[in-house]
Amino acid sequence: EKSDLRTVAPASSLNVRFDSRTMNLSWDCQENTTFSKCFLTDKKNRVVEPRLSNNECSCTFREICLHEGVTFEVHVNTSQRGFQQKLLYPNSGREGTAAQNFSCFIYNADLMNCTWARGPTAPRDVQYFLYIRNSKRRREIRCPYYIQDSGTHVGCHLDNLSGLTSRNYFLVNGTSREIGIQFFDSLLDTKKIERFNPPSNVTVRCNTTHCLVRWKQPRTYQKLSYLDFQYQLDVHRKNTQPGTENLLINVSGDLENRYNFPSSEPRAKHSVKIRAADVRILNWSSWSEAIEFGSDDG
């Protein structure tokens, strides 16, 4: 991305450099180094200090966003002297040109949509490009299918999420022939942006005294197991007065998802539908199709 790197250094420089693609800060190794330290300070004065790499002349920042501008700093002591150097990493380009209102969601277990809006001061010829890097392998995914508005990219559709990990870095760059365009970046957890499908294979079986509802957990992008799910059942008596409260039942995920409830014959016509959520986030899916049981003359 286009970004000015300005170095603030004493006479003998460490030649500090930052590669935004790998998030690696490096400097010239000094002989007889006794102490090295690197860190960044963001606009809110938060300090991030990663571990030094084995060679002690570089460090990699794992989970940082750069679009608000940051200052990197390196301190090195040798047996002879001490070095200090700052590297300013501003988000160059005209203020207000970066993509805004950026958000992504995963749906149907293996599809993802990201959307954004053009910056308020962005020129007419602005074009945005989305790059995604996963936290583990630093592999870069370029947007394969852009969603356009009057020729400007304002979203991205991905139908192959195999390159993602649980936490990913999203970067929206911009270009224009007229002026410099600022970038926008964000870190997103797949856990927090996935919208579940409703549970599948919902069935109801009744005997003379009880009804048993069974269902299967939804297929998800994240690898989740049965205890990671929470379900809500809406058991609804048909043809009741408007405003009558539905019975909402919370059920924890289990190896065999089932809910048994008393319902004696003759039973009125009922419907049941189920929705699912991650037990810790409770971001509810849409409801499953309603399944009817009982009879009109119950």
Epitope: K136, T165, S166, K191, Q222, K223, L224, S225, Y226, L227, D228, L255, E256, V279, R280
Partner: antibody, heavy 120, light 111 residues
Framework: QVQLVQSGAEVKKPGASVKVSCKIS????????IHWVRQTPTKGFEWMGG????????VYAQRFQGRVTMTEDTSIDTAYLTLSSLRSDDTAVYYC?????????????WGQGTMVTVSS | QAVLTQPSSVSGAPGQRVTISCTGS?????????VSWYQQLPGTAPKLLIY???KRPSGVPDRFSASKSGTSASLAITGLQADDEADYYC???????????FGGGTKVTVL
């Protein structure tokens, strides 16, 4: 009702290998993830390895690396643990367990355990 | 030496409340990774009691509850019963070991 049924107790000589099986009934193995944990009176519970969704493969605990292999035969809903180059301190009860949650791993259901004795 | 530290034993009279502590470090419970608790009756396999720090699987009575704060967690048993006499283990994940870690176990005796 889902159950994990493990193979019977084994007595092995040092240097030998042991293969423990874990048969799942009431559910399809292909829809589950199995981990293996052992228990000794001195060291307590030790995680040995299992499926890691982030890596999309079976991962092994560092201390068993190179000696342990975990395999599955989904056609007969059975998971296997093989431990080679057995030593006397491998004497333990070996458990297979179904992963109930991945964040972090929680063991929702355990097999009954297989006692492995390593003795010359 | 277990990675998570538990008292070796606790005891209480029937109907009483007992608590079991589980202390970890910044690479496991404090990381923060969730804690699970298991009950192991003599001669049997462990059974899950608590997951995600404080959630009970279906079938586990609400006499069992748990909480987590910082680098430690605790399990409480209220209305102690004779069949609660068992070993109890805490478990979490450790990022430095890249795997599950357990406590050494606490024997609960009903007086």
């Amino acid at each position: 009702q889902v159950q994990l049924v493990q193979s019977g107790a084994e007595v092995k000589k040092p240097g030998a290998s042991v293969k423990v099986s874990c048969k799942i009934s009431g559910h399809s193995l292909s829809e589950l993830s199995i981990h293996w944990v052992r228990q000794t009176p001195t060291k307590g519970f030790e995680w040995m390895g299992g499926f890691d969704p982030e890596e999309n493969e079976i991962v092994y605990a560092q201390r068993f690396q190179g000696r342990v292999t975990m395999t599955e035969d989904t056609s007969i809903d059975t998971a296997y643990l093989t431990l080679s180059s057995l030593r006397s301190d491998d004497t333990a009860v070996y458990y297979c367990a179904i992963v109930g949650s991945f964040s972090p791993v929680t063991y929702g259901l355990w097999g009954q355990g297989t006692m492995v004795t390593v003795s010359s | 030496q277990a990675v998570l530290t538990q008292p070796s034993s606790v005891s209480g009279a029937p109907g009483q409340r007992v608590t079991i502590s589980c202390t970890g470090s910044g690479s496991n419970i404090g990381a923060p990774y969730d804690v699970s608790w298991y009950q192991q009756l003599p001669g049997t396999a462990p059974k899950l009691l608590i997951y995600h720090n404080n959630k009970r699987p279906s079938g586990v009575p609400d006499r069992f509850s748990a909480s987590k704060s910082g680098t430690s967690a605790s399990l409480a048993i209220t209305g102690l019963q004779a069949d609660d006499e068992a070993d109890y283990y805490c478990q979490s994940y450790d990022s430095s070991l890249s795997g599950s870690v357990f406590g050494g176990g606490t024997k609960v005796t009903v007086l």
